[in-house]
Interface confidence: low
């Protein structure tokens, strides 16, 4: 698809970790756009042939989604318009660990940021009352 804007936009990610078997969040924010229809979000994972997730024209576009992520991903569709491109990853697997790219296109331009995602059997911190 074509790029309507010529400038780069700021995209920000935060390294995070996911507990195997639970749901995880890959955090990504960007400079918001006025029109949802002008926003494209692509999540990619290095070493994976297809996409992790794509959201464009206000809805998910999953025809190129890689099999290893099938049925396990979602963006927060109601928050995209305010610049939240974070990805919810269901049932985190050991093999989900790696480098992800959050790639954004808006009418203002395009931008991307990488995110290191770690997976494991992380224990919850104990809370003493």
């Amino acid at each position: 698809f074509g790029i309507s804007g010529r400038h780069s936009i700021t995209v920000t990610t935060v390294a995070s970790a996911g507990n195997i078997g639970e749901d995880g969040i890959l955090s990504c924010t960007f400079e918001p756009d006025i029109k949802l229809s002008d926003i494209v979000i692509q999540w990619l994972k290095e070493g994976v042939l297809g996409l992790v997730h794509e959201f464009k024209e206000g809805k998910d576009e999953l025809s190129e989604q890689d099999e290893m992520f099938r049925g396990r991903t979602a963006v927060f569709a109601d928050q995209v318009i305010v610049g939240n491109a974070s990805l919810r990853l269901k049932n985190v697997q050991l093999t989900d660990a790696g480098t992800y790219k959050c790639y954004i296109i808006t009418s203002k331009g395009k931008g991307n940021a990488n995110l290191e995602y770690k997976t494991g059997a992380f224990s919850m911190p104990e809370v003493n009352v």
Epitope: E46, G47, L49, G50, S63, E64, Q65, D66, E67, M68, R70, L94, T95, A97, G98, T99
Partner: antibody
Framework: EVQLLESGGGLVQPGGSLRLSCAAS????????MHWVRQAPGKGLEWVAS????????YYADSVKGRFTISRDNSKNTLYLQMNSLRAEDTAVYYC?????????WGQGTTVTVSS | DIQMTQSPSSLSASVGDRVTITCRAS??????VAWYQQKPGKAPKLLIY???IRESGVPSRFSGSGSGTDFTLTISSLQPEDFATYYC?????????FGQGTKLEIK
């Protein structure tokens, strides 16, 4: 049973063309990316090309770029490799393989010999 | 392009031996490395993916380790059926690249 079956290999003269096919069965073909990998006689494995599940992403090795075309027909559960302007160095066993973390399912291979 | 340098290129060992094959990437490939076994006249078989995860049905004597640039395939106790050629492969980025192979022979 998950299976890949290549066909279409044979003897061809330099400059000639061949089309290889890879018939998939036992899994949802349309959900997986696919690869072609080749192995020259007595040599190691060489990646040739890859295609994503719905053909939106296609990649080639420099050695075949502009001469080979990877494609797929999800309605027929079949992967293709169109090989044009063949050279002696293209002589190899050609394997199709399913894309996963690595290549988790391989066909038995089909032999391509380029010789005058 | 990312080069995968495998060593040794050949190795003689006996049944029951512990064998280690190494693979070094020319730049970091995170944990996007697979190991394959190939026997003469046969297609390669996936043994290990994501550097250390054993493929379903692969015996536990096969293990993989490493991340970044240095990777290892270990066979803890060689069995007669393990004599074959082994390849590492990176799937971190295209072009996908393989090591040159390690031929494991009976001593």
């Amino acid at each position: 049973e998950v299976q890949l079956l290549e066909s279409g290999g044979g003897l061809v003269q330099p400059g000639g063309s061949l089309r290889l096919s890879c018939a998939a069965s036992g899994f949802t073909f349309s959900s997986y990316g696919m690869h072609w990998v080749r192995q020259a006689p007595g040599k190691g494995l060489e990646w040739v090309a890859s295609i994503s599940s719905s053909s939106g992403y296609i990649y080639y090795a420099d050695s075949v770029k502009g001469r080979f075309t990877i494609s797929r027909d999800n309605s027929k559960n079949t992967l293709y490799l169109q090989m044009n302007s063949l050279r002696a160095e293209d002589t190899a066993v050609y394997y199709c393989a399913r894309a996963s973390s690595g290549m988790d399912v391989w066909g038995q291979g089909t032999t391509v010999t380029v010789s005058s | 392009d990312i080069q995968m340098t495998q060593s040794p290129s050949s190795l003689s060992a006996s049944v029951g031996d512990r064998v280690t094959i190494t693979c070094r990437a020319s730049q970091s490939v995170s944990s996007a490395v697979a190991w394959y076994q190939q026997k003469p006249g046969k297609a390669p078989k996936l043994l290990i993916y994501a550097a250390s995860i054993r493929e379903s049905g692969v015996p536990s004597r096969f293990s993989g380790s490493g991340s970044g640039t240095d990777f290892t395939l270990t066979i803890s106790s060689l069995q007669p059926e393990d004599f074959a050629t082994y390849y590492c492969q990176q799937y971190y980025s295209t072009p996908l690249t393989f090591g040159q192979g390690t031929k494991l022979e009976i001593k």
